[in-house]
Interface confidence: low
């Protein structure tokens, strides 16, 4: 599960690369595009036919410390009358992101990249019906 | 991971902030314990607000391939399979962190980068603006 090296078909390694101990990599956690903002339609989590709630998880040993997770409010979807239609399914849409995990071992600290699966929102789908013989 | 010695006054000198630059293990730890393995990956076709997935590839980034969702319709698919324009398909966007090679082309030197991706689409009731 190592990060693939740059393919030699693309580039030659520049001479200016910083020296890095074997088995590790240098990571600058000053985020590029830090101030970029999400410009989603207003209140889509409430206006959706598959509405969801947000929960903020917080961990001081994770960077970023805050990760927001969505949870679908219903099993079914909301119909035009505002009632839940259980012939349809609200399902989570998920996306992987990277975080940096800080680990303490006695008086030493180490850093590990970690994949985190974030539920971003929900969508309404037609269910897959399994017919049993 | 790569162990870094802490300050001499260890127990009392806990640094609450992350340093600007860290050395991390090349192995990425996968903690997808909350993943439902039965989750189908065809929601983009079965959704009432279906979307297409477009590939975005960049060898200077990890992951080098990211998939962008684009809603297929302005409206949503109704029970008859037709597009209902009284409802709107809208993208669900998410900021994610990726690794950017810095300096460029270096195999083991990265910087975190925040990028905005459209992950899928959802069907919403439109906001109707009444003009006086």
């Amino acid at each position: 599960r190592k990060i693939p090296k740059v393919g030699h078909t693309f580039f030659q390694k520049p001479e200016s690369c910083p020296p890095v101990p074997g088995g590790s990599m240098k990571l600058d956690i000053g985020i590029i595009n830090e101030n970029q903002r999400v410009s989603m339609s207003r209140n889509i989590e409430s206006r959706s036919t598959s509405p969801w709630n947000y929960t903020v998880t917080w961990d001081p040993n994770r960077y970023p410390s805050e990760v927001v997770q969505a949870q679908c409010r219903n099993l079914g979807c909301i119909n035009a009358q505002g009632k839940e239609d259980i012939s349809m399914n609200s399902v989570p849409i998920q996306q992987e992101t990277l975080v940096v995990r800080r680990k303490h071992q006695g008086c030493s600290v180490s850093f590990q990249l970690e994949k985190v699966l974030v539920t971003v929102g929900c969508t309404c789908v037609t269910p897959v019906i399994h017919h049993v013989q | 991971g790569i162990t870094i010695p802490r300050n001499p006054g260890c127990p009392n000198s806990e640094d609450k902030n992350f340093p600007r630059t860290v050395m991390v293990n090349l192995n990425i730890h996968n903690r997808n314990t909350n993943t439902n393995p039965k989750r189908s990956s065809d929601y983009y076709n079965r959704s009432t607000s279906p979307w297409n997935l477009h590939r975005n590839e960049d060898p200077e980034r990890y992951p080098s391939v990211i998939w962008e969702a684009k809603c297929r319709h302005l409206g949503c698919i109704n029970a008859d399979g037709n597009v209902d324009y009284h409802m709107n398909s809208v993208p669900i966007q998410q900021e994610i962190l990726v690794l950017r090679r810095e300096p460029p082309h270096c195999p083991n030197s990265f910087r975190l980068e925040k990028i905005l991706v459209s992950v899928g689409c959802t069907c919403v009731t439109p906001i109707v603006h009444h003009v006086a």
Partner: nanobody
Amino acid sequence: DVQLVESGGGLVQPGGSLRLSCAASGRTYDAMGWLRQAPGKEREFVAAISGSGDDTYYADSVKGRFTISRDNSKNTLYLQMNSLRPEDTAVYYCATRRGLYYVWDANDYENWGQGTLVTVSS
């Protein structure tokens, strides 16, 4: 769980071709991939394809030589391997996965077949 059965492996000369098949029991909408394990090496990613078959992704070492495809009506995944090299010798596995992020991470694949051996030798 989906059951996966690979076939089509065998002995082939360098420069030759093989077509591997993977039959899935029960319809799967999941993304699927081919991975391989050479003797004494870790399992590595070869190619992946989305549930619809629209999107494909290849390891650099096989790009331009291998083609992944699927026929959802037959619940079958394929790997067309051309211009085979001795270093392609391995047991080839097909597997399902949740989506096409981090395709090279073998740990993200869920259901695995038993594998089919491909030997490239003169």
